[in-house]
């Protein structure tokens, strides 16, 4: 499956909208940083099936979607923001599910590629937790959304290293 | 085939330091969490601490938190809970546990070891 | 700590009944409620996670409902292999915390 054009357009227009929904410098929260354990290996081309990272893709956008649907999410950040930010995120999760049942077959991708899944979902509950722990604070939002962007840059750059190897 | 293999039955006097542990095997090592669940003979079941075997990263129960610690060793798939200093009151069947992870990020526990038994007495 | 109660602490039935177990917990957990069986001198295995998804495996005569505060367990048409005692989990906020168990046992 040749990932459109489009996709890679979409997570960049993504990566600007978490970007201009930062409300409070990163500089007055980095007491609240944290390493939330990236799965990078996951999302590791040269390692992985294209499947694979495919798969890790659509998880780690559909957990981005989780986290910035809740209503702790809401009062966090800019409502038109946010709405476009979910726009973008949504056409992606189409966009890599019919990627993902071309490559193999929906049931098959996920017993395929459950680790990888499950890689994603630990990152992401360590993320949920940290925020439980600082009581959705504006710094661990602002933290959270460094991390996102930073992940998200991660996985752009991978896609295109996908799309060069077809 | 998913398995989760503890150590047999351990007699200790109190004040000895102590480790168990949980071999696992048939899926992929750090993929999952695994906690460690308490039984005291005749009553129920306490969870104890969890730990993410591709970095080691543990959340623990605040009743537990000192008294206990967990580790794993990832070249040989094994789970380790470890006293410095047991006391009677740590008698009891000690299960390792695999976790499940859902996409509403749900962790429930779907894989149990046989359980060991520690019995603490002077 | 969230506290989960089970009611009722012990039951007695028949091969062929159908009993009820139900779970409480001192605040909203969602529908992160998850049941086991422990069969005597055995691990616990897992029946239903989520309040109402069916372990792999485990037989259509379980079933889990309920999600917020209050869960059930129904076991229909129970078999020789049910006469255990069951327990309740959430795993919603830390720490994880039980019921402290039903023993179904033969009337």
């Known amino acids: 499956c040749d990932l459109p054009q489009t996709h890679s357009l979409g997570n960049r227009r993504a990566l600007i909208l978490l970007a201009q929904m930062g409300r409070i410098s990163h500089f007055s929260c980095l007491k609240d940083r944290y390493d939330f354990g990236f799965p990078q290996e996951v999302f590791d081309g040269n390692q992985f099936q294209k499947a694979q990272a495919i798969s890790a893709f659509h998880e780690m956008i559909q957990q981005t979607f989780n986290l910035f649907s809740t209503k702790d999410s809401s009062a966090a950040w800019d409502e038109t923001l946010l709405d476009k930010f979910y726009i973008e995120l949504f056409q992606q999760l189409n966009d890599l599910e019919a990627c993902v049942t071309q490559e193999v077959g929906v049931e098959e991708i996920a017993l395929m590629n459950e680790d990888s899944i499950l890689a994603v979902r630990k990152y992401f509950q360590r993320i949920t937790l940290y925020l439980m722990g600082k009581k959705y604070s504006p710094c661990a939002w602002e933290v959270v959304r460094a991390e996102i962007m930073r992940s998200f840059s991660f996985s752009t750059n991978l896609q295109k290293g996908l799309r060069r190897k077809d | 085939e998913v398995q989760l293999v503890q150590a047999g039955a351990e007699v200790k006097a109190p004040g000895e330091s102590l480790r168990i542990s949980c071999k696992v095997s048939g899926y992929t090592f750090t993929s999952y969490w695994i906690s460690w669940v308490r039984q005291i003979p005749g009553k129920g079941l306490e969870w104890m601490v969890k730990?993410?075997?591709?970095?080691?990263?543990?959340i623990y129960n605040p009743s537990f938190q000192g008294h206990v610690s967990i580790s794993v060793d990832k070249s040989i798939t094994t789970v380790y809970l470890q006293w410095s200093s047991l006391q009677a009151s740590d008698t009891a069947i000690y299960y390792c546990v695999r976790h499940y992870l859902t996409q509403s990020l749900v962790d429930y526990f779907d894989h149990w070891g046989q359980g060991t038994l520690v019995a603490v007495s002077s | 700590d969230i506290q989960m109660t089970q009611s009722p602490s012990s039951l007695s039935a028949s091969v062929g009944d159908s009993v009820t177990i139900t779970c409480r917990a001192s605040q909203s957990v969602s529908n992160y409620f998850h049941w086991y069986r422990q069969k005597p001198g055995k691990a616990p295995e897992l029946l239903i996670y989520s309040a109402s998804n069916l372990q792999t495996g485990v037989p259509s005569r379980f079933t889990g409902s309920g999600s917020g505060t209050e869960c059930t367990l129904t076991i229909t048409s129970l078999q020789p292999d049910d006469f255990a005692t069951y327990y309740c989990?959430?795993?919603?906020?830390?720490?994880?915390?039980f019921g402290q168990g039903t023993k179904l046992d033969v009337r």
């Open positions: 989990q959430q795993t919603h906020g830390y720490p994880f915390t």
């Open positions: 730990i993410d075997p591709r970095d080691s990263y543990t």
